[in-house]
């Protein structure tokens, strides 16, 4: 039975040209995390493999940085970066846990971080 939950940074906003950290945290399970995939819609942004380290997709190499931790830093944001982002935790023996973050990239300087929330 999958008992874990993923806590994410939830709905967040950031300014155009700035950067943002996408963070997920898996809790309430003793399952071993073997890999975390970061995806935007159906595009793979990055992989963090527990044994080997990070792989950043070539098309995002200039604007995506690993970390902190299992998180992902998006840089030089554009309004086209607005949308859903998913952290996909591959675990053993539980299986796969997925967290969702919605990022809105704003033109103005009124961007603020949203509240944290949980996805079972």
């Amino acid at each position: 039975m999958m008992t874990g939950t993923i806590e994410t940074t939830g709905n967040i906003s950031a300014e155009k040209g700035g950067s943002i950290i996408l963070q997920c945290h898996l809790s309430s399970t003793t399952a071993q995390v073997t890999q975390v995939n970061w995806e935007q819609q159906d595009q793979l942004l990055a992989i963090c493999n527990a044994d080997l380290g990070w792989h950043i997709s070539p098309s995002f190499k200039d604007r995506v940085a690993p970390g902190p931790g299992l998180g992902l830093t998006l840089q030089s944001l554009t309004v086209n970066d607005t949308g859903e982002y998913f952290c996909i935790y591959h675990t053993y023996p539980d299986g796969t846990y997925t967290g969702r973050i919605f990022l809105e990239v704003l033109e103005s300087s009124v961007a603020e971080h949203g509240a944290r929330f949980q996805i079972p």
Partner: antibody, heavy 117, light 107 residues
Framework: EVQLLESGGGLVQPGGSLRLSCAAS????????VSWVRQAPGKGLEWVGY????????YYADSVKGRFTISRDNSKNTLYLQMNSLRAEDTAVYYC??????????WGQGTLVTVSS | DIQMTQSPSSLSASVGDRVTITCGAS??????LNWYQQKPGKAPKLLIY???SLHTGVPSRISGSGSGTDFTLTISSLQPEHFATYYC?????????FGQGTKVEIK
């Protein structure tokens, strides 16, 4: 005691194929990722590829991508490296190594692969 | 790929000497740096992982330090069993990459 034992090396002609095996014992094989690392004669270490413990996903060095395939049989505690389209530059001692926390914490004794006509 | 550069490529030292080997990464690898010892005809052995953590059974006279791009392996008092080749390896960005090795020889 953790043990890894490679086999299957030998002399093969350029363009030929070879399958290496790595028999594991002394630990729960299905809980660990495993890599192949090679060392050309008199040279340094080069990572070849990796296979995840449970889901079986793999990563490869660019130098072997499309030619080498890693697989594992958790029921037999065995790792495999299928090498096709072999080249002279693939000549090396091939080690299997258990992956742990980013390092390779236990290694086999190695098996020599010689690609020559 | 991240390039790992070790220095020196070889060194001569005597039993009891303090020996330092450095390893530099072409970009930050945080603390994801491992050190191995290899003797002729033998497989490498893990000495240190995550820059400074000793692997099981490794004597405390061997230590590692550093973070970011610059790392050091130190043997505080060289013993006969320490004459070997040492490799650093990063595990921050796939593919894992090794330094070219540092051979420690008897003076």
């Amino acid at each position: 005691e953790v043990q890894l034992l490679e086999s299957g090396g030998g002399l093969v002609q350029p363009g030929g194929s070879l399958r290496l095996s790595c028999a594991a014992s002394g630990f729960t094989f299905s809980n660990y990722g495993v890599s192949w690392v090679r060392q050309a004669p008199g040279k340094g270490l080069e990572w070849v590829g990796y296979i995840n413990p449970s889901r079986g996903y793999t990563y490869y060095a660019d130098s072997v991508k499309g030619r080498f395939t890693i697989s594992r049989d958790n029921s037999k505690n065995t790792l495999y490296l299928q090498m096709n389209s072999l080249r002279a530059e693939d000549t090396a001692v091939y080690y299997c190594a258990r992956s742990y926390g980013g390092g390779f914490d236990y290694w086999g004794q190695g098996t020599l692969v010689t690609v020559s006509s | 790929d991240i390039q790992m550069t070790q220095s020196p490529s070889s060194l001569s030292a005597s039993v009891g000497d303090r020996v330092t080997i450095t390893c530099g990464a072409s970009q930050t690898i945080e603390r994801r740096l491992n050190w191995y010892q290899q003797k002729p005809g033998k497989a490498p052995k893990l000495l240190i992982y995550d820059a400074s953590s000793l692997h099981t059974g490794v004597p405390s006279r061997i230590s590692g330090s550093g973070s970011g791009t610059d790392f050091t392996l130190t043997i505080s008092s060289l013993q006969p069993e320490h004459f070997a080749t040492y490799y650093c390896q990063q595990s921050y960005i796939i593919p894992p990459t090794f330094g070219q090795g540092t051979k420690v020889e008897i003076k």
